[in-house]
């Protein structure tokens, strides 16, 4: 049985979508800024029809490795999933490796495509630049995600976001639209546009198949 709750907002995305939130856990974001980032994720989740049938979500914090807090197959109430998203711990690490988290997304989250009818999107929230030695396979992972029909939407936040990587992601596919913001303060202003863009990329559920009409018998 699907665990659903009534919508919280007028705009409510009811599409077939597997959405992964990837949160930069580097010290380029202060703890306060990271809290704004989490609030943005929670706000977005409020605008999605989260369930195993409609929008499935995953939440991953990345630093030099990746830490999944929510998996696509987690069967929990939307309010509980939002609560878990709000509890993501601030790592404040020296490094946040986009290459590692895209590798994780490719080989762990989307290793098996169990919902081919749904769109697959990775929302990459990035505020830092990984060291060059870590980014050797970056393009390979982006291309691997493209092969698996995973759309990557980078959201660059602040002056240290890796614009070169953002442009490389955009180049890989026309759907890989980037949003570049000067600070976390702009997340709230951009939220509705980002949610609408994600939602438009996902298919609507096909109408339920009805049994063929029974022939009407008339008695003369």
């Amino acid at each position: 049985k699907d665990i659903s709750e009534p919508p919280l907002h007028d705009f409510y995305c009811s599409r077939l979508l597997d959405l992964v939130f990837l949160l930069d856990g580097s010290s380029r974001l202060s703890e306060a800024e990271f809290e704004v980032l989490k609030a943005f994720v929670v706000d977005m989740m409020e605008r999605l029809r989260i369930s195993q049938k409609w929008v499935r979500v995953a939440v991953v914090e990345y630093h030099d490795g990746s830490h999944a807090y929510i998996g696509l197959k987690d069967r929990k109430r939307p309010s509980e999933l939002r609560r878990i998203a709000s509890q993501v711990k601030y790592a404040g690490s020296q490094v946040a490796s986009t290459s590692e988290v895209l590798k994780y997304t490719l080989f762990q989250i989307f290793s098996k495509i169990d919902r081919p009818e749904a769109s697959r999107i990775a929302l990459l929230l990035m505020a830092s630049q990984e060291p060059q030695r870590m980014s050797r396979n970056f393009v390979r992972y982006v291309q691997g995600l493209k092969k698996k029909k995973v759309i990557v939407i980078p959201v660059g936040i602040g002056p240290h976001a890796n614009l070169k990587q953002i442009r490389l992601i955009e180049k890989q596919a026309p759907e890989n639209k980037a949003f570049v913001l000067s600070s976390v303060d702009e997340l709230e202003q951009q939220r509705d546009e980002i949610v609408s863009y994600l939602c438009d990329l996902a298919p609507e559920a096909p109408p339920p198949t009805l049994p063929p009409h029974m022939a009407q018998v008339t008695v003369g």
Epitope: S30, E31, A32, E35, A39, R83, S86, Q87, V88, Y90
Partner: nanobody, 122 residues
Framework: QVQLQDSGGGLVQAGGSLRLSCAAS?????MAWFRQPPGKEREFVAV????????LVAASVKGRFTISRDNAKNTVYLQMTSLKPADTAVYYC??????????????????WTGGTQVTVSS
């Protein structure tokens, strides 16, 4: 169990300043100020994080209110300047055990003070 004690409220003329204090009995990760104007809901004002001293301030008071912390005294301050009659409210200090809920939601915070009244007259 964390104990919180606030102080510093009072009556002030519009355009004036006040400094609220909130002392904690134990170590806290985040400390926030909320306020409840008469007949309205309790609303977020500001928060400070002990890990790096970073702060968030509500848009409605940005540029007028600042939150700061004295780690040695385990005390957080809310410096309020250019006060307006609309700032009249009971001000509460709060802290949380864990991070469950967004920073601006009251449900996140486990420990609260009884509140200190701030009245701004025109």
């Amino acid at each position: 169990q964390v104990q919180l004690q606030d102080s510093g409220g009072g009556l002030v003329q519009a355009g004036g300043s006040l400094r609220l204090s909130c002392a904690a009995s134990g170590r806290t990760k985040d400390m926030a100020w909320f306020r409840q104007p008469p007949g309205k809901e309790r609303e977020f004002v500001a928060v400070i994080y002990s890990s790096d001293g970073s702060t968030l301030v509500a848009a409605s008071v940005k540029g007028r209110f600042t939150i700061s912390r004295d780690n040695a005294k385990n005390t957080v301050y809310l410096q309020m300047t250019s006060l307006k009659p609309a700032d009249t409210a009971v001000y509460y200090c709060a802290t949380s055990r864990g991070y469950s809920g967004t920073y601006y939601s009251t449900s996140r915070y486990d420990y609260w003070t009884g509140g200190t009244q701030v009245t701004v007259s025109s």
